[in-house]
């Protein structure tokens, strides 16, 4: 318990000691069990990495980044005409960013609120399944696209109508999988009251006796198995793809597809350094050392890892961007704050005015003309 | 050895203000969440406020809410209580106090010796 | 709010007598219980915190237990120095509510 007197704290890290067990009152109410943390813990939960510096992050990432999946959302749903599997692939990787950002306000009021938690278990629970959900839900779409990248370039013949059933069946089981994964996320309770702060807790404080098995198997499995592999096919698609466009004849169309391509992989590469390695590495590290030695020294670094990692509902937008012509489009008109059919229209009335002012064959909603700047 | 020591206490006429001070020494006084609780002559002992170490969150009962302020001076070492629009129950004697817990507080291990505060017309 | 109700209101024990105070809070406040002796003219002084542990220096005559609503402070081999004003404080939920007091006296 965190005892100014007693300096020897039990752990760095957020393991909740049980002060009272619970207990059923006369009216047959069961008494939630009460926690109390080690003085370290205590520090983290009160202290600015907490309550000013995740808050600022995260209000980044929501403000960024659900425009930029909901545009690309809309974009990919109702603006792009072929659903080809890399659409596919990045509408359920928009729709992913999106489920975990839009419970971003509730996190930001959560932490400039001192850690204090007031909108009950559920909630706690969705939005704690749905950022670990998205982590995994990201790796795992970009997995799929990068491979899916790569087997354009190998074989760019193919039955569209095919392969797009194939990107719906893939993306459906990953939603499935995530859901089964993320299963002991909702199961397990995540709202802590701790007394000595007067704060009720989400995930940020665990049970003593849950965090030290079980949460290091769990994360342990999914660092394995929902990042570690598919990192290495996300990798291996990538350094195939370099090869590949190494060896083929350069035109200058050609020379414009290596080039986004490789801007891909470096936005992609950068998603891996910043979101996914760092928070998948110190998850399995943190609960290691919780587990090994009863304290985790990397508990500030694990804390900024876990929010950084949200950082990929930013990057994302970057990798529809490269691979996506619609959404290029989109967003290009998006920024200069017009439309695409008014780029379209004020294209059209050029060339109309151009060949002929009498003439007035053009239409508004040609779809024919492509924006270029 | 933890030392508080409370001042400003003294006579007021109702619905006036006053200010009570606490100089804290003899621990890192940043690190620490700190309380006022008074006794009214031959009562019991009753919260009023608490403050955490940053003087980020506050807290008090309603019979306070709304006229009494705690503050506190992390660089000067001082806790406050300003208590505006007094009344006749206010007169008690004020205590500065100290948790055990270092960032929290369940209960108040040290107190300083009180400061006086009457309400009378 | 969380009410705390102490029994009795006082009592009279002879020196090296066992007295025994009680706690009712109205709601269950899971251990988050101490006791306060004060006496006359001088600032209360913490003796049990967490229902049961014993502040240093406290002697190890006095005792806490209890779990849930029901907490009891207990005082083996009544000294001169026990003599005071006993309150019970939960520490659970704000605002922190303290007992009305139990006067202890030396028959």
């Known amino acids: 318990t965190i005892q100014g007197t007693n300096r020897s704290s039990k752990g760095r890290s957020l393991i909740g000691k049980v002060d009272g067990t619970s207990h059923v009152t006369g009216k047959g109410v069961t008494v939630e069990t009460v926690f109390s943390v080690d003085e370290f813990s205590a520090s983290v939960l009160t202290g600015k990495l907490t309550t000013v510096f995740l808050p600022i992050v995260y209000t980044i990432v929501f403000v960024v980044g659900l425009p930029s999946n909901g545009m690309a959302l809309w974009v990919f749903l109702f603006r792009t005409k072929k659903k080809h599997p890399a659409v596919i692939y990045m509408a359920n990787l928009a729709l992913a960013d999106l489920l975990s950002v839009i419970w971003f306000p509730l996190k930001i009021a959560y932490h400039i609120h001192g850690n204090n938690w007031i909108y009950g278990e559920a909630l706690c629970n969705v939005l704690i399944g749905f950022f670990y959900g998205n982590m995994y839900c990201s790796i795992l779409f970009m997995t799929c696209l990068s491979v899916q990248r790569y087997w354009v370039i190998v074989n760019p013949m193919g039955h569209s109508r095919k392969k797009a059933n194939i990107a719906i069946g893939i993306s459906l089981a990953i939603w499935l999988l995530i859901l089964l994964v993320t299963i002991p996320l909702y199961v397990v309770k995540q709202t802590i009251f701790i007394p000595a702060l007067n704060i009720t807790t989400c995930h940020d404080v665990l049970p003593e006796q849950l965090l030290v098995g079980d949460m290091f198997n769990y994360f342990l499995s999914l660092a394995i198995g929902v990042f570690l592999f598919p990192a290495f096919l996300t990798a291996s698609a990538y350094v195939l793809m370099i090869r590949m466009l190494r060896s083929s004849a350069m035109d200058e169309n050609s020379e414009k597809k290596r080039k986004r391509a490789i801007k891909l992989i470096v936005t992609v590469l950068a998603m891996y350094l910043i979101c996914f390695t760092p928070s998948n590495l110190l998850l399995v590290v943190h609960y290691f050392l919780i587990k090994s030695q009863g304290q985790s020294h990397v508990y500030a670094l694990y804390i900024v890892a876990l929010c950084l990692s949200t950082l990929n509902s930013c990057i994302d937008p970057f990798v529809y961007y490269f691979v996506s012509h619609d959404f290029r489009d989109h967003a290009k008109n998006a920024l200069l704050c017009r439309s695409v059919r008014t780029v379209k229209q004020m294209q059209v009335s050029l060339t109309s005015k151009k060949h002929s002012r009498k003439s007035s064959s053009y239409s508004s909603s040609s779809t024919t003309v492509k924006t270029s700047y | 050895e933890v030392q508080l020591v409370e001042s400003g206490g003294g006579l007021v006429q109702p619905g006036r203000s006053l200010k009570l001070s606490c100089v804290a020494s003899?621990?890192?006084?940043?690190?620490?969440?700190m309380s006022w609780i008074r006794q009214a002559p031959g009562k019991g002992l009753e919260w009023v406020a608490s403050?955490?170490?940053?003087?980020?969150?506050?807290f008090y009962p309603d019979s306070v809410k709304g006229r009494f302020t705690i503050s506190r001076d992390n660089a000067q070492n001082t806790l406050y209580l300003q208590m505006n629009s007094l009344r006749s129950e206010d007169a008690a004697t004020y205590y500065c106090?100290?948790?055990?817990?270092?960032?929290?507080?369940?209960?108040?291990?040290?107190w300083g010796q009180g400061t006086l505060v009457t309400v009378s017309s | 709010d969380i009410q705390m109700t102490q029994s009795p209101h006082s009592l009279s024990a002879s020196l090296g007598e066992t007295v025994s105070i009680e706690c009712l809070a109205s709601?269950?406040?899971?251990?988050?219980l101490a006791w306060y002796q004060q006496k006359p003219g001088k600032s209360p002084q913490l003796l049990i915190y967490?229902?049961?542990s014993l502040k240093d220096g406290v002697p190890s005559r006095i005792s806490g237990s209890g779990s849930g609503t029901q907490y009891s402070l207990k005082i083996s081999n009544m000294q001169p120095e026990d003599e005071g004003v006993y309150y019970c404080?939960?520490?659970?939920?704000?605002?922190?509510?303290f007992g009305g007091g139990t006067k202890l006296e030396l028959k």
């Open positions: 709601e269950a406040i899971s251990n988050y």
């Open positions: 404080q939960q520490g659970y939920k704000y605002p922190r509510t």
């Open positions: 003899g621990f890192t006084f940043n690190n620490y969440w």
């Open positions: 403050i955490t170490n940053t003087g980020g969150r506050i």
């Open positions: 106090t100290r948790d055990r817990l270092y960032y929290g507080s369940n209960w108040f291990t040290y």
């Open positions: 967490y229902a049961s």
